[in-house]
């Protein structure tokens, strides 16, 4: 017991932490002072009626990853204030409704990863009227969803069901929940997908399918009996798909009349881009989908891809596309031309070079595009990049950060409406007239700049942290500046006069520099009460670098002696 007790530390607010120890039972002596109790990653196997009896003010109880196989019936009887209960990844093979009955305040319940076959004989959650987040199921033994399982639940913010090995689904089991903001469904096989889909289409706003093999998925007409689908977003995460089954998935998505957003994360496409519909399949209507997000798409036979043209017509209404970290080196010109409504395109962490980008940004490509993100691609020339994008007449925001440009030419051409340019982490060591004068926001942080002397008459925000600047930029060159972030440079001082010369400045972040704490600098920074409103990282990030005897101290706290300040 005493070693158990020693493994637990509580602060004055009643937050008690005892995770990742060698506890084999809940420590004794817990009182009403305990508000939060984290005993995750221990070796607790048994919870008795008396363990938590006095914890009447307990709001959070985390018991994940122990070896709990038994919870006595009345173990939680005094936990009427409990809001958060995590029993995930234990050895609970039978769930009892008596555990949850007293938990009238519960908003979060996690029962994932316990070896139960079903959610019990009676409705477990019917008394949990305040429940917002519920996680149930496991990877292997949870095989059956019953009609009574979710009875009594009317609204959930998030429902996660690990039904990886689901073999039986009683119709209408999920229909009883009137509204679920986000349903996450883990299913290895797709056999019961359509049955579940029918039940959730009118109650779920965001549907997320995880870990499913859809290679052989075939859509058959649904008998929904109603067409008012609530689903606004459908996410496929770690899902396997083929050319043919993608077409089948699109037919399923056709059933969702109000679908606005489609997302594929960590998916595998086992295909070569052969999306031609067979003759008896009617043309797919993309409906109202405005946002398409693809992250880390794996295409094993990527270099065999040959014809995406059957998909082009589906893209005309899409407004936002993200294809991130998916080895994209070319967007076909014809596809770009079909993306007539596209306003936002994010191709971060891909393989684009200027010469292939030119093919993508061909004449009439992306006519509505306002934001283009090409962060961390293979761009190497600012001049070529700017020139390549001249076809994009409405482009205002460009992020080409994390490309290695190294140098910057004296002049460049850019789309004429440009307002935002991100050149952070591009290894540039100087800024020149290549930067367009129309900019309102410029980010050149994390580079090798030791000088910034550009006249940017419309610039409102300058992000130039993590460079090698020794002084603030000349305010007269930036007459409209509102925000200046210049932390972690080599600035040793700045004066009242310098700050006052930025007439419009509202926010300055200049911490993390090597300040020489002269009497003048200390006097100015310590006496200006208004300074704290402008310096958003004051006082914590403003440390003296010299004189040596005050090095590391906060500027606001340093006091120099009279003799130091009145030397003749």
């Amino acid at each position: 017991e005493s070693s158990n007790q020693a493994s637990l530390s509580c602060d004055r607010n009643g937050i008690c932490k005892g995770s990742s120890g060698s506890l084999n039972s809940i420590p004794s002596g817990l009182t009403e002072a305990v508000k939060s109790l984290d005993l995750s990653n221990n070796r607790i196997t048994y919870i008795s009626n008396s363990d938590l009896q006095r914890c009447v003010n307990l709001q959070a109880l985390v018991l994940t990853s122990n070896g709990i196989n038994t919870i006595e019936e009345d173990s939680f009887s005094s936990l009427g204030s409990l809001e958060h209960l995590d029993l995930s990844y234990n050895y609970l093979s039978n769930l009892s409704s008596s555990w949850f009955k007293p938990l009238s305040s519960l908003t979060f319940l996690n029962l994932l990863g316990n070896p139960y076959k079903t959610l019990g004989e009676t409705s477990l959650f019917s008394h949990l009227t305040k429940l917002q987040i519920l996680r149930v199921g496991n990877m292997d033994t949870f095989t059956k969803i019953q009609r009574k399982d979710f009875a009594g639940l009317t609204f959930l913010e998030e429902l996660e069901i690990d039904a990886s090995d689901l073999q039986s689904y009683e119709p209408k089991s999920l229909k009883s929940i009137q509204n679920v903001s986000h349903l996450i469904l883990h299913m290895k096989q797709h056999i019961l997908l359509l049955e579940i889909f029918v039940d959730v289409t009118s109650s779920v706003e965001c549907l997320e399918l995880r870990d499913t093999d859809l290679d052989t998925f075939h859509f058959s007409e649904l008998s929904t009996g109603e067409t008012n689908s609530l689903i606004k977003k459908f996410t496929f995460r770690n899902v396997k798909i083929t050319d043919e089954s993608l077409f089948q998935v699109m037919k399923l998505l056709n059933q969702i009349s109000g679908l606005l957003e489609l997302e594929f994360d960590d998916c595998t496409l086992n295909g070569v881009g052969n999306f031609r519909a067979s003759d008896n399949d009617r043309v797919i209507d993309p409906g109202k989908v405005e946002t398409l997000t693809i992250r880390r798409l794996h295409i094993p036979r990527f270099y065999l891809f040959y014809d995406l043209s059957t998909l082009y017509s589906l893209t005309e209404r899409v407004k936002r596309i993200t294809v991130e970290n998916s080895k994209v080196f070319l967007v076909p010109c014809l596809l770009s031309q079909h993306l007539k409504s596209l306003e936002y395109l994010d191709l971060s962490e891909n393989l684009m070079v200027e010469e292939y980008l030119k093919n993508s940004a061909c004449e009439d490509a992306w006519p509505s595009l306002q934001t283009l993100i090409l962060r961390q691609n293979h761009l190497a020339s600012l001049e070529k990049t700017g020139e390549t994008l001249l076809t994009l007449k409405n482009l205002t925001n460009i992020d080409i950060s994390k490309n290695s440009f190294h140098s910057m030419p004296e002049t460049c051409q850019w789309p004429e409406k440009m307002k935002y340019l991100n050149l952070s982490s591009t290894r540039i060591h100087s800024v020149t007239g290549c930067i367009p004068k129309t900019l309102e926001i410029l980010d050149v942080s994390n580079n090798n700049l030791n000088l910034f002397s550009l006249n940017l008459p419309q610039l409102k925000e300058l992000y130039i942290s993590r460079n090698k600047l020794m002084t603030l930029p000349d305010a007269s060159l930036l007459p409209m500046l509102l925000v200046l972030k210049i932390s972690r440079n080599a600035i040793t001082t700045f004066s009242k006069e310098q700050l006052d010369s930025f007439h419009t400045l509202k926010t300055l972040e200049a911490g993390g520099n090597n300040f020489i704490c002269s009497c003048e600098f200390l006097s100015f920074t310590q006496e200006q009460q208004a300074l704290a409103k402008v310096l958003i990282d004051w006082p914590a990030n403003y440390l003296c670098d010299s004189p040596s005897h005050v090095r590391g101290q906060q500027v606001q706290d340093v006091r120099l002696s009279v003799s130091e300040c009145h030397r003749t």
């Epitope: 794996h298 080895k327 010109c333 010469e355 994390k402």
Partner: antibody, heavy 118, light 111 residues
């Protein structure tokens, strides 16, 4: 500047394995692919395979699929290529090269000579 | 596999002459309007050096006397005025289909 520095020459007996290294500098290692190409004496170039350090994904020429393994140590910005069950026909200079734009090899290592002889 | 056939096997030129090297692919290397064909130069004892990518894009730092053209299956590398330093082997390479393949090479020598 971009550099790929390869390990030194190797003399191996038939049936043995060889593991070659390629240390990258001057660029963000995880952003680019690394390819391996070989050139037998007086012959042309033969593509072996690639790896993308960011996710560890690989692709191989079928001729090498069973014998070649390509790995990376991202913390050391180094790629490795191991070739097993060596035979005399594997005597060649082995090059690593940076893959840019998904399609072309813009920087090459100096090459490692592997001689397989009994 | 896509087979790349280069011709001629050897090209012997005087300084200042124009060199035309050819590479023919057994099938198209087009990819949505871009030809995925590269040209490399290799001097004895050195690794190959990229000259041209995407059939016609000259790699940065490569002298402008080098140019590439072609589409589909037929590609050409031209050296407008050959110089002594241009001697070596020239290889074409396709990255349209796996496995990536190289041509057998053309040897350029100065008379």
């Amino acid at each position: 500047q971009v550099q790929l520095v390869q390990s030194g020459s190797e003399l191996k007996k038939p049936g043995a394995s060889v593991k070659l290294s390629c240390k990258a500098s001057g660029f963000t290692f995880t952003t680019y692919g690394i390819n391996w190409v070989r050139q037998a004496p007086g012959q042309g170039l033969e593509w072996i395979g690639w790896i993308y350090p960011r996710d560890g994904s690989t692709n191989f020429n079928e001729n090498f699929k069973d014998r070649a393994t390509i790995t990376v140590d991202t913390s050391a910005s180094t790629a490795y290529m191991e070739l097993s069950s060596l035979r005399s026909e594997d005597t060649a200079v082995y090059f690593c090269a940076r893959l840019t734009g998904g399609t072309f090899l813009d920087y090459w290592g100096q090459g490692t000579t592997v001689t397989v002889s009994s | 596999d896509i087979v790349l056939t280069q011709s001629p096997a050897t090209l012997s030129l005087s300084p200042g002459e124009r060199a035309t090297l050819s590479c023919r692919a057994s099938e198209s290397v087009e990819y949505y309007g871009t030809s995925l064909m590269q040209w490399y130069q290799q001097k004895p004892g050195q690794p190959p050096k990229l000259l041209i990518f995407g059939a016609s894009n000259v790699e940065s730092g490569v002298p402008d006397r080098f140019s590439g053209s072609g589409s589909g299956t037929d590609f050409t590398l031209k050296i407008s005025r050959v110089e002594a330093e241009d001697v070596g082997m020239y290889f074409c390479q396709q990255s349209r289909k796996l496995p990536w393949t190289f041509g057998g090479g053309t040897k350029v020598e100065i008379k």
